[in-house]
Interface confidence: low
Amino acid sequence: GQFRVIGPRHPIRALVGDEVELPCRISPGKNATGMEVGWYRPPFSRVVHLYRNGKDQDGDQAPEYRGRTELLKDAIGEGKVTLRIRNVRFSDEGGFTCFFRDHSYQEEAAMELKVEDPFYWVSPG
């Protein structure tokens, strides 16, 4: 059956060195355990994280994300997943695309990550 993919409608903010979570879901909600789920970075489609055949496909990851990502699948039975990125870098700022593929049917959603410097502050008046 058909579905649409929904990501955050507002940019998600994170501090350098922190971890960040990028949520994504399908609507109507349904079990996505058997689907291929992933995140990539446009415009060059560098793979951030890929889940296929019931497991994470670490070998397909872009080197800059290896060991830094985790797919939170607690609610995958309802079609909801979250990508956790650890040790956020300035280079992570920008667009991400989440996708769900069920056999030949694929939908995706774009989202944006804003990365901020934890040591930048403005002195009061």
Epitope: Q2, F3, R4, I6, G7, P8, R9, H10, P11, I12, R13, P23, R25, S27, P28, G29, A109
Partner: antibody, heavy 122, light 107 residues
């Protein structure tokens, strides 16, 4: 139990200002986007504005853009709607509503306040 | 803006009747549709979201279907407490828009 209680409605003259408040309880207020929806007497529902969980992003209906400002104070669990340059056509019951999801796209509303009536008349 | 058109605007029905309300979007909205029930002097109550998902605590006699531009809310066996006004709402794109409402009255 989730509760949303709106206050601040009343009678105001055209061109005047009013600030609505919505006190929230029974859920993690700082995790959810919130909206204002209004209903003119005897009419249907009209979405007015919404704000994301942190207050960093806001959206408005064209009919109120530039006149209304939505804001929130997560420390006080309170949502606000500052209404300026009020017009007769702004007369309505204003509902505060909780978005179903936290920071996810797709605003629909699982909890609503009882509403507060704003009457704009000279 | 996406225009949501409900039909009929009002209907009369008896307890036990099967009632169907339709909602049409002016452009495709996938399954990004919610249905609400509103009684006089009260706030709306969420019944259905994602076009067909039943909100927790809502009786199973309510069901939703459709995708794209055409959607349906069905009450399989109308109960006395179901006499109210029903609204559809799209949340596919800003601004979120509602249908004009369908009033279900006692025959």
């Amino acid at each position: 139990e989730v509760q949303l209680v709106e206050t601040g409605g009343g009678l105001v003259q055209p061109g005047g200002s009013l600030r609505l408040s919505c006190a929230a309880s029974g859920f993690t207020f700082s995790s959810y986007a919130m909206s204002w929806v209004r209903q003119a007497p005897g009419k249907g529902l009209e979405w007015v504005s919404d704000i994301n969980h942190s207050g960093g992003s806001t959206y408005y209906a064209d009919s109120v853009k530039g006149r209304f400002t939505i804001s929130r104070d997560n420390s006080k669990h309170t949502l606000y709607l500052q209404m300026n340059s009020l017009r007769a056509e702004d007369t309505a019951v204003y509902y505060c509503a909780k978005d179903y999801y936290d920071i996810l796209t797709g605003s629909f509303f699982d909890y609503w306040g009882q509403g507060t009536l704003v009457t704009v008349s000279s | 803006d996406i225009v949501m058109t409900q039909s009929p605007s009002s209907l009369s029905a008896s307890v036990g009747d099967r009632v169907t309300i339709t909602c049409r979007a002016s452009q495709g909205i996938s399954s990004a549709l919610a249905w609400y029930q509103q009684k006089p002097g009260k706030a709306p109550k969420l019944l259905i979201y994602d076009a067909s998902s039943l909100e927790s605590g809502v009786p199973s006699r309510f069901s939703g279907s459709g995708s794209g531009t055409d959607f349906t809310l069905t009450i399989s066996s109308l109960q006395p407490e179901d006499f109210a006004t029903y609204y559809c709402q799209q949340f596919n794109s800003y601004p979120w828009t509602f249908g004009q409402g369908t009033k279900v009255e006692i025959k």
